[in-house]
Interface confidence: low
């Protein structure tokens, strides 16, 4: 039997699938039908976007051979796509902080301001989330020094 938390998640899952297969959902008279399965702009304030961002930056830090943690300076663009789960597409500017990787990754670490240690990177992340399973995967990650 679905518990108090699982029931709404199950409904969300059913809704997501229904939206994904509905060919003209969200269309209005005089406008071409918009495929709900296509990417749409998302707000950085959304909890799902925040979680996806934290996950992607965490993976970036794990993979980088940098002495320091990086964190988001700004999210340039956020989009999401409802599929069997949710694809998040995030364009993010990252900055190197003064926190080393031997320290916990603190969200409020200040950014380096010394010219020889300052570093920015621009990254495009694609994160696949299945909220009702609590899983996230970094499907794509491309970064370049900014």
């Amino acid at each position: 039997m679905a518990g108090p938390l699982r029931a709404p998640l199950l409904l969300l899952a059913i809704l997501a699938v229904a939206l994904a297969v509905s060919p003209a959902a969200g269309s209005s008279p005089g406008k071409p039908p918009r495929l709900v399965g296509g990417p749409m702009d998302a707000s950085v304030e959304e909890e799902g976007v925040r979680r996806a961002l934290d996950f992607a930056v965490g993976e970036y830090n794990k993979a980088s051979n940098d002495m320091y943690h990086s964190r988001a300076l700004q999210v340039v663009r956020a989009r999401k796509q409802i599929v069997a789960g949710v694809n998040y597409f995030l364009d993010v500017e990252l900055g190197r902080t003064t926190c080393t990787k031997t320290q916990p990754n603190l969200d409020n670490c200040p950014f380096h301001d010394q010219p020889h240690l300052k570093r920015k990177a621009f990254c495009s992340f694609q994160i696949y989330a299945v909220p009702w399973q609590g899983t996230m995967t970094l499907s794509k990650s491309t970064c370049q020094d900014a």
Partner: nanobody, 114 residues
């Protein structure tokens, strides 16, 4: 250009000690944060210890109280004193520094604890 040359690795028994050195040229050593990384076989490279230009140190939990990072600004050399070595410390050890947004790596020295 920045050059780093690590040395001092070798084969040692569990519980033994080694001291790694890293000679640095081509940068203002005194101002640079320096670090030792290691890459165990088949694993990701990981940060072991870091020392700032001001001499503050920071260690990975796995080596705390066993390893000591230090620097000699006159000799322009970075050190890693490794005591109470364990088989899981087996890895290639690299010294590294950052300058102008770039990270520079030494060639690496092999440490085998067996």
């Amino acid at each position: 250009d920045v050059q780093l040359q690590a040395s001092g690795g070798g084969l040692v028994q569990p519980g033994g000690s080694l001291r790694l050195s890293c000679a640095v040229s081509g940068t203002n050593f005194r101002l640079n944060d320096m670090a030792w990384y290691r890459q165990p076989p088949e694993k990701r490279r990981e940060l072991v210890a870091l020392i700032t230009g001001g001499g503050n140190t920071s260690y990975a939990d796995s080596v705390k109280d066993r390893f000591t990072i230090s620097r000699d600004n006159i000799q322009r050399t970075l050190y890693l004193q490794m005591n109470s070595l364990k088989p899981e410390d087996t890895a290639v050890y690299y010294c590294t520094t950052q300058r102008s947004g770039r990270q520079y790596w030494g060639k690496g020295t092999h440490v085998t604890v067996s």
